[in-house]
């Protein structure tokens, strides 16, 4: 499968969109970082299928998706931005999925690594966690979008190998 | 490939200001804040403070808010520091230089410097 | 300000031998798992290069034999083996509050 041009393109505006989200000054906010454990491991991608490294990115953008969906998240982000950033990531869950159909049968291995996929929903459950403890604060929300920020970015290196993989 | 080009060598007199710049290329300029940093001769560093070039915000080390002043152009993606009632202190290089890692506050790319030289 | 303070303020290393810099800040610059921390390597006339972050991520590109440790307020970069290509200025830098500071800078020779 072959991962067109557009979905880089679209992480690439996924990244501008959540840069421009931001409402208030992150260094009002130093205090309330916070180390998610983002699990890199899952990112690094030398271990997997290519099948099981697309099932990885579909389930952090379909959690990042989850995450900002919240009538929470609603309240905190602009609308018009927040609509931009739904549009875009539901872009990239289509050509993810139509990636894992075409790789129905091209490889031994299964489609999905349980284990990453887990690991993933942990670590957006320790995001979610953080958010509620702080009380979905701007800052509390302003962490999480840094660390939203930093972890597309490290998708990112993936989708670029997987499409050096080709 | 990223790199950041600042201007040149500048000679200016005791209580006269300055304005250097800073050119951005290889990245998205506006999604990225740019710190600056001072380095006297033979001495350590010293950060001044940031712009975000996105939306002009800024952050200052207090040391610094009343000597520089940052600015963006993003149509010509390039950053901006003036310094303003010089004097011998302020005699150094400035570097420009990209923020890394989102809220982790390092620095990856730098510019080459602006040397400052303030002499009567 | 939080200030830091590096030691040595010069050291000589044979080569192939450790070279370890300490960089102690005056109030703790780690907060819910991360140590604000970073390092970078100056070279003369050169710009500053980051070598370490969060006090020990080694930066893409950087030799393994760079490497970083420490939380809190106590925290050392330990080159080994030592390179002739390593004599260079080493700063510590936090970013744990505003505004960030750097170390004064320890001086690598190599003997």
């Known amino acids: 499968c072959d991962l067109p041009q557009t979905h880089s393109l679209s992480n690439r505006r996924t990244l501008m969109i959540m840069a421009q989200m931001g409402r208030i000054s992150p260094f009002s906010c130093l205090k309330d970082r916070h180390d998610f454990g983002f699990p890199q491991e899952e990112f690094d991608g030398n271990q997997f299928q290519k099948a099981q490294a697309i099932s990885v990115l579909h389930e952090m953008i379909q959690q990042t998706f989850n995450l900002f969906s919240t009538k929470d998240s609603s309240a905190t982000w602009d609308e018009t931005l927040l609509d931009k950033f739904y549009t875009e990531l539901y872009q990239q869950l289509n050509d993810l999925e139509a990636c894992m159909m075409q790789e129905v049968g091209v490889e031994d291995t299964p489609l999905m690594n349980v284990d990453s996929i887990l690991t993933v929903r942990k670590y957006f459950q320790r995001i979610t966690l953080y958010l509620t403890e702080k009380k979905y604060s701007p800052c509390a929300w302003e962490v999480v979008r840094a660390e939203i920020m930093r972890s597309f970015s490290l998708s990112a290196n993936l989708q670029e190998r997987l499409r050096r993989k080709e | 490939q990223v790199q950041l080009q600042e201007s040149g060598t500048v000679l200016a007199r005791p209580g006269a200001s300055v304005k250097m710049s800073c050119k951005a290329s290889?990245?998205?300029?506006?999604?990225?804040?740019m710190h600056w940093v001072k380095q006297r001769p033979g001495q350590g560093l010293e950060w001044i403070g940031v712009?975000?070039?996105?939306?002009?915000?800024?952050t200052y080390n207090q040391k610094f808010k009343d000597k520089a002043k940052l600015t963006a152009v993003t149509s010509a993606n390039t950053a901006y520091m003036e310094l303003s009632s010089l004097t011998n202190e302020d005699s150094a290089v400035y570097f420009c230089?990209?923020?890394?890692?989102?809220?982790?506050?390092?620095?990856?790319?730098w510019g080459q410097g602006t040397t400052v030289t303030v002499s009567s | 300000d939080i200030v830091l303070t590096q030691s040595p303020a010069s050291l000589a290393v044979s080569l192939g031998q450790r070279a370890t810099i300490s960089c102690r800040a005056s109030?703790?610059?780690?907060?819910?798992?991360?140590?604000?921390m970073h390092w970078y390597q100056q070279k003369p006339g050169q710009t500053p290069k980051l070598l370490i972050y969060?006090?020990?991520n080694l930066e893409s590109g950087v030799p393994a034999r760079f490497s970083g440790s420490g939380s809190g307020t106590d925290f050392t970069l330990n080159i080994h083996p030592v390179e002739e290509e390593d004599a260079a200025t080493y700063y510590c830098?936090?970013?744990?509050?505003?505004?960030?500071?750097f170390g004064s800078g320890t001086k690598l020779e190599i003997k």
């Open positions: 230089t990209r923020n890394y890692k989102y809220d982790y506050y390092t620095m990856d790319y």
């Open positions: 290889g990245y998205s300029f506006t999604t990225y804040w």
């Open positions: 712009i975000y070039p996105g939306n002009g915000d800024t």
């Open positions: 109030k703790s610059v780690s907060t819910s798992g991360h140590s604000y």
């Open positions: 969060l006090a020990s």
């Open positions: 830098q936090h970013s744990g509050e505003l505004p960030f500071t």
